[in-house]
C-alpha cells in the first residue's frame, strides 16, 4: 500500500507511517515502528502536558512565587498547569498572573464601584451629587449625604463629594 500523506486525529506522520500521539499527561519516548506502538511515559511530579502530543519533555508546573505575592489557586496535575492567584489585598498584573500588585484605593471624592479580586483591580467612580467619600479605601462605596430633614434638622453646611452635609437645628421663629 501507498504510504500515507495525512493521518487521523490523534496521530502524526513520521517515517511514512502514522503513529499515535501520546495522551495528555504523558510524553513521547519512542515513535511507533513496524513492530510496536508509540511508546509514552507519564509526566513526572510537578510536570504536565495538556494536549495529545509528541513532546519528548513534559512542561514544568508554574511556580506561584510568594515573594511576588502569589499563591496556588489550583494545584497542577499531570494534565493541567498550576493556576496562581494573588494574596489577599493584591491582584494579578496580567492574565498569566506572573506577579501581583496591591489593590488601589479610591481617593476621597471617589467610591468603590467594584471591589478588587485576585485577578482584577479596584474600580473607582466619582461620587455623584448627593454622595460623598471622605476616606482613601479599597472597599468603601460613596455614602449618601445625611438627610437632615428626616432628623427634623436643617442643612447648615452643604455637602461635597468629599464631605457630608452638616445638619443643625431649625431656627425657631420668635413671637
Amino acid at each position: 500500500p501507498e504510504p500515507p500523506t495525512a493521518c487521523r486525529e490523534k496521530q502524526y506522520l513520521i517515517n511514512s507511517q502514522c503513529c499515535s500521539l501520546c495522551q495528555p499527561g504523558q510524553k513521547l519516548v519512542s515513535d511507533c515502528t513496524e513492530f510496536t506502538e508509540t511508546e509514552c511515559l507519564p509526566c513526572g511530579e510537578s510536570e504536565f502536558l495538556d494536549t495529545w502530543n509528541r513532546e519528548t519533555h513534559c512542561h514544568q508546573h508554574k511556580y506561584c512565587d510568594p515573594n511576588l505575592g502569589l499563591r496556588v489557586q489550583q494545584k497542577g496535575t499531570s494534565e493541567t498547569d498550576t493556576i496562581c492567584t494573588c494574596e489577599e489585598g493584591w491582584h494579578c498584573t496580567s492574565e498569566a498572573c506572573e506577579s501581583c500588585v496591591l489593590h488601589r484605593s479610591c481617593s476621597p471624592g471617589f467610591g468603590v464601584k467594584q471591589i478588587a479580586t485576585g485577578v482584577s483591580d479596584t474600580i473607582c467612580e466619582p461620587c455623584p451629587v448627593g454622595f460623598f467619600s471622605n476616606v482613601s479605601s479599597a472597599f468603601e462605596k460613596c455614602h449618601p449625604w445625611t438627610s437632615c430633614e428626616t432628623k427634623d434638622l436643617v442643612v447648615q453646611q452643604a455637602g461635597t463629594n468629599k464631605t457630608d452635609v452638616v445638619c443643625g437645628p431649625q431656627d425657631r421663629l420668635r413671637a
Epitope: V29, S30, C32, E34, F35, E37, E39, L41
Partner: antibody, heavy 114, light 112 residues
Amino acid sequence: QVQLQESGPGLVKPSETLSLTCTVSGFSLPTSGVHWIRQPPGKGLEWIGVIWAGGDTNYNPSLKSRVTISKDNSKNQVFLKLSSVTAADTAVYYCLGHGHFDVWGQGTLVTVSS
Amino acid sequence: DIQMTQSPSSLSASVGDRVTITCRSSQSLVHSSGNTYLQWYQQKPGKAPGLLIYKVSNRFSGVPSRFSGSGSGTDFTLTISSLQPEDFATYYCSQTTHVPWTFGQGTKVEIK
C-alpha cells in the same frame, strides 16, 4: 547494518550484582531505545526492561527492585545491572534495538554460582 | 502483566505436515490505535530468536510463505503449511502492545 553485542562476566556469585554491556552499531542510541531480554537454560523468554532514546526507562515489575539500565551514548553502549542475584537469574541475556526486532545480539550466558 | 499461553507446549510432526500453534493472551492485544502487536519468533538451539511474523499476520522479509499468522483480540495462530526439515525448532509468541512485554512459554516442534 544493525548489530548488537553483549559482554560481561560469565560467572557471578549469589547475592552479588550482575553487570552486562551491550555495544551497538548501525543505529543511534540518542534516537533509539534498547531492550534487555533473558532466557534461563531450557526455558522461555523474559523481558527485563528498556532504556529509551532520551534515557527514560521501563522495567519488568517482577525485576524492578533489582534492575538498573543505563547508557553511554558517546560509546554506543547500554548497561544492565541486576543486584542480589540468585541461581534463578542464571540465563542467556540478550539485548535488542527498539524497532529492530529482527536483529538480536548473540546473547551471553551468565551463571550464578558460588 | 499480560499472560501469553501457547499450546501445545510440544508436538511431533513429519516433513510435509501442516502444523498449527496457538497463542492466547490474558487480555486483548488491540491497541487504541487499532493495531495489534503480536509477533512470532523461531529459535533454534544455541541461537537467538529470529522474527517470523509481526502485527499478527505480516511475514518478515525473507520468511518463507509457508509461515502464516492469523487471529485477533486474544486468540492467535501460527501455521506452517508444509513443514520443512529446517523448521524443527521452538516457536514463541510475543506481545508488544502493553508494557511489560511478554512471551509465550514456547512450542517445541520435533521430528516424529
